[in-house]
């Protein structure tokens, strides 16, 4: 029917914008479209340098730089709450000239029974209550309004949604006589979107729902629901996309099985299975239909929920994610790594890489780390010579490019970037590791030896001598 939103499978482009767009209000800058780079493809670096130089020279003229902070707004609908019944909320920094909105979901694990929720309440209360939230937050990484720190979307409207529901953004139950805690993660997102519509989101062209760790999983669980909500509220033209950072977990076999006692040693499948019941968790409808009743926990795992999603989603995941290793009971303490553990770690990277093979928009460096997109130095890591902001820019272009009915990637603008080398930090652009005792930065070779990887074993599959490999790694190749 006329005006009905047509949801797109990931990797497909949105319909071209209508020819007659409403004229911007007087004094409002026109939102720019991605540039057509075809004419300058050969000399892209020099062109980008000129654009950056121009942006930086114009930047001091704007009022944007006067206040870097995002300001706290507690929800007006106080029935949508954090775990302890205090109102949920969001931090906002408006960018009036932009029709791009970035909504970021914070991470911070979860709790799945009264005991570990009580303990969390007495240790990490800011993740369960808004009572002590600061009035402002500084935007970092992808939430920064500085073009130097955020070359991707520095001019967007920035929204940081604090995580205070402990339910991987999936819960839909309120506090009551029976329930000591409210778990309203899914409802918090819906309510934030509803309130933002009155603050300018109604005029948005693109809404990017992003998140890290539990927030990254929250993106996968909520992105289609946000798109459906906007459509139902009469905003079918807002393109909803997802950016899931460090939230793509595997329900693999733990290195050492432990009983489900606390949050970080409980096998993820068991923790989520218990959590869903405790939180009254909701999962994407299309995914839920693929599994039997009681098996909804499957939808918390990226590789299972992703094929059911309609909105385009970009997946960012370290191949050796620290949270994944933690729930798998792998604890790297600098003691020599036994062969069984080394093979387990390498296999984890291989399995994760395999789950991303059909994810057209992905960035997966072979590093041992956790979370990236709101780190100040999120621009530093590269996969196959491409940084994450650049890959996201290419993703934007691929979604905007209306003649992209063919699946061929844009020339010189890759979006599927998954490291193929097989061990932690084999990518020389990985975040630096420091030696615990000296505080000195370690290069990749030092790090691998520090972890107990035998250089002979590491070099052999590459068809190299240990000395050759050490030389290559020390040179950052």
């Amino acid at each position: 029917s006329e005006g009905r939103k047509t949801w797109r499978r990931r990797g497909q482009q949105p319909p071209p914008p209508p020819r007659t767009e409403a004229a911007p209000a007087a004094g409002q800058p026109v939102e720019s479209f991605p540039l057509d780079f075809t004419a300058v493809e050969g000399n892209m670096d020099s062109f980008m340098a000129q654009v950056k130089s121009l942006a930086q020279s114009l930047y001091p003229c704007s009022a944007q730089q006067l206040n870097e902070d995002l300001r706290l707004h507690l929800l007006l609908n106080t029935s949508v709450t954090c775990n302890d019944g205090s109102p949920a909320g969001y931090y906002l920094k408006e960018s009036r000239g932009s029709r791009r909105w970035l909504l970021f979901l914070e991470g911070g694990w979860y709790c799945f029974n009264r005991e570990n929720c009580d303990s969390r309440y007495d240790t990490m209360r800011r993740l369960m209550s808004s009572r002590d939230w600061p009035r402002t937050r500084t935007g970092t990484g992808i939430l920064s309004s500085q073009p130097e720190e955020n070359p991707y979307w520095w001019n967007a409207n920035m929204v940081f949604i604090p995580y205070c529901s402990s339910d991987v953004w999936s819960g839909a139950s309120s506090k009551s006589e029976k329930n000591e805690y409210a778990f309203m993660g899914a409802l918090i997102i819906q309510e934030v979107v509803r309130e933002l519509l009155g603050r300018g989101l109604s005029g948005a062209k693109v809404l990017l729902l992003a998140g890290s760790a539990a927030g990254g999983t929250g993106v996968l669980l909520n992105v289609d629901r946000v798109a459906e909500q906007l459509e139902k509220l009469g905003y079918p033209a807002i393109q909803v996309r997802g950016l899931a950072d460090s939230g793509w977990f595997l329900d693999n076999k733990q290195y050492r099985h432990t009983d489900c006692v606390d949050t970080i040693t409980c096998a993820p499948t068991e923790a989520i299975r218990r959590g869903i019941r405790y939180w009254n968790g909701v999962v994407p409808e299309r995914c839920r239909r693929q599994f039997q009743e009681g098996e909804e926990w499957n939808c918390f795992f990226g590789y299972k929920v992703y094929p059911t999603l309609r909105c385009p989603v970009f997946v960012v995941q370290w191949l050796f994610d620290e949270a994944q290793l933690t729930v798998d009971n792998v604890h790297l303490t600098g003691q020599p790594v036994q062969e069984g553990l080394r093979l387990y770690i390498q296999n984890l990277g291989r399995e994760l890489r395999h789950t991303l093979k059909d994810v057209p928009a992905s960035f997966a460096p072979a590093c041992l780390s956790h979370e990236i997109i709101i780190r100040s130095h999120w621009t530093d890591v590269q996969v196959k010579g491409t940084s994450l902001p650049r890959a996201l820019h290419c993703w934007d272009r691929s979604l905007h490019d209306s003649h992209k009915a063919s699946k061929t990637p844009l020339k010189g603008c890759p979006v599927h970037l998954v490291d193929s080398c097989p061990w932690p930090h084999c990518n020389p652009s990985c975040p630096t590791v420091r030696d615990q005792f000296t505080g000195q930065e370690m290069n990749v070779a030092q790090f691998l030896m520090h972890m107990g990887f035998d250089m002979q074993t590491v070099a052999q599959p590459q068809g190299l001598e240990p000395s050759e490999l050490l030389g290559m790694l020390s040179n950052g190749s």
């Epitope: 914070e106 991470g107 694990w109 303990s119 309440y121 240790t123 990490m124």
Partner: antibody, heavy 119, light 111 residues
Framework: EVQLVESGGGLVKPGGSLKLSCAAS????????MHWFRQAPEKGLEWVAY????????YYADTVKGRFTISRDNAKNTLSLQMTSLRSEDTAMYYC????????????WGTGTTVTVSS | DIVLTQSPASLAVSLGQRATISCRAS??????????MHWYQQKPGQPPKLLIY???NLESGVPARFSGSGSGTDFTLNIHPVEEEDAATYYC?????????FGSGTKLEIK
């Protein structure tokens, strides 16, 4: 002034019982999870027990489970540790401590009360 | 339980020099930008005193010569310049899960 003061320590025979108390003042007691720790002579710090801010959840170290009971009275701003079936290895200085709810560190400690288990 | 390995067990530092104490956890104690590791000072006959919380935050009233750093599993307490009154035993403690555990302590002696 924010303060914790322990009392109730003393000399007791093996198999005997003792009840320690910790009086809190200068802060909203009901907002904080509370812990008991102990330190044997010339030894390090050992965690003993925890009670959540609302008393719903309690945890014990394996070494005291089934013998010690932690409780609190938020109306009276007091924390207690009932110790039974005492052993010589329970001899230590016992401290109560306030756990900060945004970090889980112990920012306020009592001065301690000595428990000696000896025949 | 998370085991905290503190090193060295004791150290002697000259007045005005730097003292560095390390603490390694058997599991990652950081999440969502916070590292749940803390440092305490204890003098004979006194209860422990909080110095540094959440890896790097100085407790109010603690001199700025104390600083903490680290994330994941590896953490460090630095004291610089060391003063006479810093002679004490220092403990690290995590609060990532129950039970909270402490390192075995580092005894600092001033030369």
């Amino acid at each position: 002034e924010v303060q914790l003061v322990e009392s109730g320590g003393g000399l007791v025979k093996p198999g005997g019982s003792l009840k320690l108390s910790c009086a809190a003042s200068g802060f909203t007691f009901s907002d904080y999870g509370m812990h008991w720790f102990r330190q044997a002579p010339e030894k390090g710090l050992e965690w003993v027990a925890y009670i959540s801010s609302g008393s719903r959840t309690v945890y014990y170290a394996d070494t005291v489970k089934g013998r010690f009971t932690i409780s609190r009275d938020n109306a009276k701003n007091t924390l207690s540790l009932q110790m039974t079936s005492l052993r010589s290895e329970d001899t230590a200085m016992y401290y109560c401590a306030r756990k900060h709810y945004n970090g889980g560190y112990f920012d306020v400690w009592g001065t301690g009360t000595t428990v000696t288990v000896s025949s | 339980d998370i085991v905290l390995t503190q090193s060295p067990a004791s150290l002697a530092v000259s007045l005005g020099q730097r003292a560095t104490i390390s603490c390694r956890a058997s599991k990652i104690v950081s999440t969502s930008g916070y590292s749940y590791m803390h440092w305490y000072q204890q003098k004979p006959g006194q209860p422990p005193k909080l110095l540094i919380y959440l890896a790097s935050n100085l407790e109010s009233g603690v001199p700025a010569r104390f600083s903490g750093s680290g994330s994941g599993t590896d953490f460090t307490l630095n004291i610089h310049p060391v003063e006479e009154e810093d002679a004490a035993t220092y403990y690290c403690q995590h609060s990532r899960e129950l039970p909270p555990t402490f390192g075995s302590g580092t005894k600092l002696e001033i030369k």
